[in-house]
Amino acid sequence: LEASEEVELEPCLAPSLEQQEQELTVALGQPVRLCCGRAERGGHWYKEGSRLAPAGRVRGWRGRLEIASFLPEDAGRYLCLARGSMIVLQNLTLITGDSLTSSNDDEDPKSHRDPSNRHSYPQQAPYWTHPQRMEKKLHAVPAGNTVKFRCPAAGNPTPTIRWLKDGQAFHGENRIGGIRLRHQHWSLVMESVVPSDRGTYTCLVENAVGSIRYNYLLDVLERSPHRPILQAGLPANTTAVVGSDVELLCKVYSDAQPHIQWLKHIVINGSSFGADGFPYVQVLKTADINSSEVEVLYLRNVSAEDAGEYTCLAGNSIGLSYQSAWLTVLPEEDPTWTAAAPEARYTD
């Protein structure tokens, strides 16, 4: 069960190429996401002639223009130029809308605003800026996990946020490990949750005009310790032709942090087993579960020598589990290969 919220990319608004010169009105405090070109090959964004860096509050990144929270100084002309040329892919002007929303505590310290300017904007009671990110109200997470509750909001004046647990002010002082309040993200983070963290968590967002609140319910599941569980049938016996690529897959489920190894069974002095009765193996890959792609063993350009038995071995503090599969490698010219087994890869 995932407790902490997934990182969601805002829908990317791509201005049409037929309207190369256009104006977009953006409300203050609103995030901006604009596309230009395709992902890695996307164009470079410029503001008033200066190229935007790939990091920072306002950034040009992988063909995207991203502004975390639109401020008055972000208004102006933006160009997107094709990589390696001066071809203009986008030409647009961002205009400041008339509602002031929340500032972002992460913003560049250089961008100061005169608080007196705020009164030129209409006052507005707090409101949720991303209610879709708050849809998950009931959280049930294993003990030890990290939980993050978010209540992204805005208003004028910029509202404050405070948290209640079971209706009482919550600062985490009685909680081992405390809590992290990230006001710029409107979030409450609790690491290594325990059963005493169960309860109703309320974010209370207030300004001079009004207040709003939202409830989350947290249950903490006590772990029943067990050794890693491997999905049945994986890795799967696989047949491949010489020169092809092979993927062996191993799905591991474990509460306690598991450690995974891919092993190839080998023969030493004509024997597959040592005097201790254990098989001779060669360790091909080893990592923790949260390493990328550790559950997949890639074999590139296989040869006859790659044929044999492969084992996925997973261990945690409670014990070990393993499952094995055989790789059969056929010669390139074998006609039965083409007829019977055209797909070299195991697919999930």
């Epitope: 998950k136 009931l138 049930a140 059963p195 169960r198 939202y214 319910l217 599941l221 006590e222």
Partner: antibody
């Protein structure tokens, strides 16, 4: 396919007790908040109680507080409602329902009728 | 506790007509509102959650809208199987509360 099957209803005298069960199948029961909702004859829906996946959190409607106890056995995929000190106004069809992560009730059982009468 | 008020309490319409059912909360419940349909002798069935998202398998003629305190359920063209009682339910805060229901009858 998600299925919820209530049982244990029947006729009981005022002041008596009953234990309702709800057998769940087709989903990982131990991950879901579960709720009991009742409906008196010819009336609307009234929430009775909910329980968290671990059983460590429970909540009751004021009308049943102190008399009803919700519990669950995750090893048996079963939800329970122990009803004591029953009153005539507890007469209703009792439904168990699964709460989605967003707290709406996405699956309901067919209900079991509890009649409290002398 | 939050109060949920549905209107009208009953509605008599012919097949093919458009039905609009209302639900009002006594205080803001954001978009944490569900709509349920109940036919005689059956359990309720979830139609809409999050004020406007149709549950799995619910026909497109059912549309939910609203946020805060005012919500509505619209059935664009009534079919014979749509005649039932409709309940709204808030799940923004505990206790969860249902409206008293709107009975939709054949005219």
């Amino acid at each position: 396919e998600v299925q919820l099957l209530e049982s244990g209803g029947g006729l009981v005298q005022p002041g008596g007790s009953l234990r309702l069960s709800c057998a769940a199948s087709g989903f990982t029961f131990s991950r879901y908040f579960m709720k009991w909702v009742r409906q008196a004859p010819g009336k609307g829906l009234e929430w009775v109680s909910w329980i968290s996946p671990s059983g460590g959190l429970t909540e009751y409607a004021d009308s049943v507080k102190g008399r009803f106890t919700i519990s669950r056995d995750n090893s048996k995929n079963t939800l329970y409602l122990q009803m004591n000190s029953l009153r005539a106004e507890d007469t209703a069809v009792y439904y168990c329902a699964r709460a989605s992560y967003g707290a709406w009730l996405d699956y309901w059982g067919q209900g079991t009728l509890v009649t409290v009468s002398s | 506790d939050i109060q949920m008020t549905q209107s009208p309490s009953s509605l008599s319409l012919s097949p093919g007509e458009r039905a609009t059912l209302s639900c009002r909360a006594s205080q803001s419940i954001n978009r944490n509102l569900g709509w349920y349909q109940q036919k005689p002798g059956q359990a309720p069935r979830l139609l809409i959650y999050g004020a406007s998202t149709r549950a799995t398998g619910i026909p497109a003629r059912f549309t939910g809208s609203g946020s805060g305190t005012e919500f509505s359920l619209t059935i664009s063209s009534l079919q014979s199987e749509d005649y039932a009682i409709y309940y709204c339910q808030q799940y923004d805060n505990w206790p969860i509360i249902f409206g008293q229901g709107t009975r939709l009858e054949i005219k």
